[in-house]
């Protein structure tokens, strides 16, 4: 007798999800010597344990603690790059500027980047048909809770000057409902973080507006200042320069200090 399956509004688990996570883990630990000690099978078991057999609208940060523990990683706390609504460019930047790190440059962020996953209550099956949508179904779904958990930990680890890359082409340059606006901003530690420097990336070739005067940036400045962290904003006008360096990664002068 076929079991009734809950239909969610979001896309289902990414195909070949277990194989993808395991393969990414192996690749990451091969490339990063400091993570060579990680047992990727244990990582997958912990990842799976966070959502399998659990109702996909009842996931908690606690469910991910075994995975967090296995994926514990030290990145230079003064070289953290946060981003909001401009992931690809942020990743191009850290691909070139190798001494800076986005969340997706860490093991846990790398494992889950661009993937979707969920299970079903009381069965060991992975749901490849549909998963809960954050808005239409529920916020405590496996994917949202994972990113909230790792984002909080990443922000808590930051120190000195923290950079955030923001998309100047969007109507809300700073969106307080984004992961950056709702999680990371509030988990920067004032006793460790001296300054948050926002890089507002301009899209248009002839764009010469001062987007640091945007009302949403003023809102961000207000939130950060109230947390006793200094705020700085810079207009960045030529994002194509990142790509030029990415195309020529052998050119060390793109990456090194001048």
């Amino acid at each position: 007798v076929p079991r009734w399956r809950q239909q969610w509004s979001g896309p289902g688990t990414t195909k070949r999800f277990p194989e993808t996570v395991l393969a990414r883990c192996v690749k990451y630990t091969e490339i990063h010597p400091e993570m060579r000690h990680v047992d990727c099978q244990s990582v997958w078991d912990a990842f799976k344990g966070a959502f399998i057999s659990k109702h996909p609208c009842n996931i908690t940060e606690e469910d991910y603690q075994p995975l967090m523990k296995l994926g514990t990683q030290t990145v230079p706390c003064n070289k953290i790059l946060l981003w909001s609504r401009i992931k690809d460019l942020a990743h191009q930047f850290t691909q070139v500027q190798r001494d800076m790190f986005t969340l997706e440059d860490t093991l846990l962020g790398y494992l889950a980047d661009d993937l979707t996953w969920c299970g079903e209550f009381n069965t060991s099956k992975i749901n490849y048909q549909s998963c809960p949508d954050w808005r239409k179904d529920c916020s405590n779904n496996p994917v949202s809770v994972f990113w909230k958990t790792v984002s909080r930990r990443f922000a808590e680890a930051a120190c000195d000057v923290v950079h955030v890359m923001l998309n100047g082409s969007r109507s809300k340059i700073f969106d307080k409902n984004s992961t950056f606006g709702s999680v990371e901003v509030h988990n920067l530690q004032p006793e460790k973080v001296q300054t948050l420097e926002a890089w507002v990336i301009h899209g248009g070739r002839e764009d010469s507006r001062d987007l640091c005067q945007d009302p949403t940036i003023k809102e961000l400045e207000s939130i950060i200042s109230k947390r006793n962290i200094q705020f700085s904003c810079k207009n960045i006008y030529r994002p194509d320069k990142f790509l030029q360096c990415v195309k020529n990664p052998e050119d060390s002068s793109c990456t090194s200090e001048i």
Epitope: F93, W199, R238, K241, Q244, N248, C254
Partner: antibody
């Protein structure tokens, strides 16, 4: 090490033309924006023109727009500035300058300059 | 377009601290660069991104940028620091601008 060597300067009459070249070495030329900056005798620095690495984007100061054309040949590691309808006020030392990478838009390296004199 | 204003000249005794200012509307929203130029020579980048020093530039050179003013500071000024200094910023499109320059005299 990075080297930029300008050539093509000289004496030209008002209304005349001149083509400056800048031979680059010591870095991956196509990765960088390149620029021309000039300095009139006894005066300050003035940015003239810039070009992206690929080279799809070109930029010009208002003072030269429509008269000067920047271009590059990445296979030859060479930057050019075609100057037409020259005026006395274009008299200056012209420097070729390599942009800084990534989020920075300033000049990491400069050539020694080539003198352009516009006079009848 | 932003306009960058520098004092035409600054004098300092050897070993003292020289400060050269560069002002423009909301300059803090843009990265500022400083160049040193000696007579008959090409400019040399001494500070980029407001406060970063290129390799080979002595530690006595430092920079800051807040409000409407960027400042180049030379601590323990030496005779060899006598030169013209230019600030520069970029405000998008074809708006790459230099300040008018400051002549630093070491007395």
């Amino acid at each position: 090490q990075v080297q930029l060597v300008e050539s093509g300067g000289g004496l030209v009459q008002p209304g005349g033309s001149l083509r400056l070249s800048c031979a680059a070495s010591g870095f991956t030329f196509s990765s960088y924006y390149m620029n021309w900056v000039r300095q009139a005798p006894g005066k300050g620095l003035e940015w003239v023109s810039g070009i992206s690495g690929d080279p799809s984007n070109t930029y010009y100061a208002d003072s030269v727009k429509g008269r000067f054309t920047i271009s590059r040949d990445n296979s030859k590691n060479t930057l050019y500035l075609q100057m037409n309808s020259l005026r006395a006020e274009d008299t200056a030392v012209y420097y070729c300058a390599r942009d800084l990478p990534l989020v920075y838009t300033g000049f990491a390296y400069w050539g020694q300059g080539t003198l352009v004199t516009v006079s009848s | 377009d932003i306009e960058l204003t520098q004092p035409p000249s600054v004098s300092v005794a050897p070993g003292q601290t020289a400060r050269i200012s560069c002002s423009g509307d909301n300059l803090r929203h843009y990265y500022v660069y400083w160049y040193q130029q000696k007579p008959g020579q090409a400019p040399v980048l001494v500070i980029y991104g407001d406060s970063k020093r290129p390799s080979g530039i002595p530690e006595r050179f430092s920079g800051s940028n807040s409000g409407n003013t960027a400042t180049l500071t030379i601590s323990g000024t030496q005779a060899e620091d006598e030169a013209d200094y230019y600030c520069q910023t970029y405000t998008g499109g074809a708006s790459l601008v230099f300040g008018g320059g400051t002549k630093l005299t070491v007395l």
